[in-house]
């Protein structure tokens, strides 16, 4: 696993503890909360990041709590169970033995149940719609410039291949970024769209997960793009299973 050998830190995840105890004295970094070794040349999985976030002491937390109106995966933050690869386990339970099934981005996709609840597989989120509202500007951004800048950002900051950025829509002041990545399209080593979306979401909130790198400075032809609202919608390869009571609520 990689990290800067001179000062032994993890460029892609500041919520790690790093020490030169890898093979040959190489720097190795482990995620807070889980203690799992992470690959610092790429994004850390959302599951490990959520676990690290929940393990941070409340009084030492440097992250801004979302307001009561913020939409955070419907159910808010929770301490997830991650598999040995750092992915979300299909079934998540809290300390009071309430359980539910989640998709590959950790969002609940069934009603809550008890310990007898079965989640047969981790259902892949293959389509993510990131809905942004930008602050007022003198004029609308040029759509093609905005499109190019957002694709460049996802490529160069999150290492997400542009083939997974399906579209960028713009109707001032709303920007929609569509990420698509089917199971069959995702090759070994490809960044997961769920992880890229999570890093982007945290960047937009001013809570960058990157170590020692400036926060997100989004500009379109030199004009700052300042986001004032973010909503993220997740579509799974298999539709979620909620009761009619929830659907009509």
């Amino acid at each position: 696993h990689t990290a800067a050998q001179d000062n032994c830190t993890c460029p892609t995840n500041k919520m790690t503890v790093c020490s030169p105890d890898g093979p040959g004295g190489r720097c190795q970094c482990r995620a807070l909360g889980s203690g799992m070794a992470v690959d610092c040349s790429t994004l850390t999985s959302k599951c490990l990041l959520l676990k690290a976030r929940m393990s941070a002491p409340k009084n030492a937390r440097t992250l801004v709590r979302p307001s009561e109106h913020a939409l955070v995966d419907n159910d808010g933050l929770y301490d997830p169970d991650c598999d040995p690869e750092g992915r979300f386990k299909a079934r998540q339970c809290n300390q009071t033995s309430v359980c539910w099934c989640v998709n590959s981005v950790g969002v609940r996709r069934t009603d809550k149940g008890d310990l007898s609840l079965r989640c047969d597989e981790l259902v892949r989120t293959h389509h993510i719609l990131i809905d942004l509202r930008h602050r007022p500007t003198a004029g609308a951004f040029n759509h093609s410039d905005l499109d190019a800048e957002l694709r460049r950002l996802f490529r160069e900051r999150y290492r997400l291949h542009p083939k997974f950025v399906a579209a960028v829509h713009y109707e001032q002041p709303t920007i929609q970024i569509e990420l698509r990545q089917n199971t069959s399209q995702k090759a070994a080593g490809d960044v997961d769209i769920g992880d890229a979306a999570y890093y982007f979401e945290r960047d937009i909130k001013g809570e960058s997960l990157f170590q020692g790198r400036g926060g997100l400075d989004l500009r379109v032809r030199g004009e700052p793009l300042q986001v004032e609202r973010t909503l993220i919608y997740y579509l799974d390869e298999i539709p979620p299973k909620f009761s009619m009571k929830r659907l009509t609520a």
Partner: antibody, heavy 119, light 108 residues
Framework: QVQLQESGPGLVKPSGTLSLTCAVS?????????WSWVRQPPGKGLEWIGE???????SYNPSLKSRVTISVDKSKNQFSLKLNSVTAADTAMYYC????????????WGQGTLVTVSS | DIQMTQSPSTLSASVGDRVTITCRAS??????LAWYQQKPGKAPKLLIY???SLESGVPSRFSGSGSGTEFTLTISSLQPDDFATYYC??????????FGQGTRLEIK
């Protein structure tokens, strides 16, 4: 077998524009690869100029960005380089290359074309 | 920009020798490093990508290792065809692509 072939004038006048084209065979320019230009001044090392994706996304070396334009012609399965305001320092062997990965490493190269800037 | 520094600049060796070329990055680049071989009058040829993955068709005597800021290319048993100039290249996400200055491998 993927092949790349550079073409264009071998001599350009100072302050003029260097224009080169790279014809791609054995792969579609619309595949999920990057199409790059790299140059090498005589007896020196390699310098990345910039690259393009089939959708038109470009990325340029900041040291050359103000003078460079890379474009793609999907109908002809080729891509092109334009470098403005050239000087003798731009004399080099110019290579086109296919970039693999999200950020490019270069798995296929053209044989190169020497461009001399001189009056 | 990330600077890539290769050492040595020139290396003299004999057929059958084991040789090592080093490449250092000015900041951590993870394992996003490639190695190329270039012969006079020819285009570079990809040998190694992602620091240690051998490109298809490249002889197994070539190997790469390292991560972060320090990388090595090793040729386990030098063959006559291996005398050439070798370049490293970083392709980290957060910087323009840059190459090392090259290492010329010559016959002793």
């Amino acid at each position: 077998q993927v092949q790349l072939q550079e073409s264009g004038p071998g001599l350009v006048k100072p302050s003029g524009t260097l224009s080169l084209t790279c014809a791609v065979s054995g792969d579609s320019i619309s595949s999920h690869n990057w199409w790059s230009w790299v140059r090498q001044p005589p007896g020196k090392g390699l310098e990345w100029i910039g690259e393009i994706y089939h959708s038109g996304i470009t990325s340029y070396n900041p040291s050359l960005k103000s003078r460079v334009t890379i474009s793609v012609d999907k109908s002809k399965n080729q891509f092109s380089l334009k470098l403005n305001s050239v000087t003798a320092a731009d004399t080099a062997m110019y290579y086109c290359a296919r970039g693999s990965g999200v950020i490019s490493y270069f798995d296929y190269w053209g044989q190169g074309t020497l461009v001399t800037v001189s009056s | 920009d990330i600077q890539m520094t290769q050492s040595p600049s020139t290396l003299s060796a004999s057929v059958g020798d084991r040789v090592t070329i080093t490449c250092r990055a000015s900041q951590s680049i993870g394992n996003w490093l490639a190695w190329y071989q270039q012969k006079p009058g020819k285009a570079p040829k990809l040998l190694i990508y992602k620091a240690s993955s051998l490109e298809s068709g490249v002889p197994s005597r070539f190997s790469g290792s390292g991560s972060g800021t320090e990388f090595t290319l090793t040729i386990s048993s030098l063959q006559p065809d291996d005398f050439a100039t070798y370049y490293c290249q970083q392709y980290d996400s957060y910087s323009p692509i840059t190459f090392g200055q090259g290492t010329r491998l010559e016959i002793k």
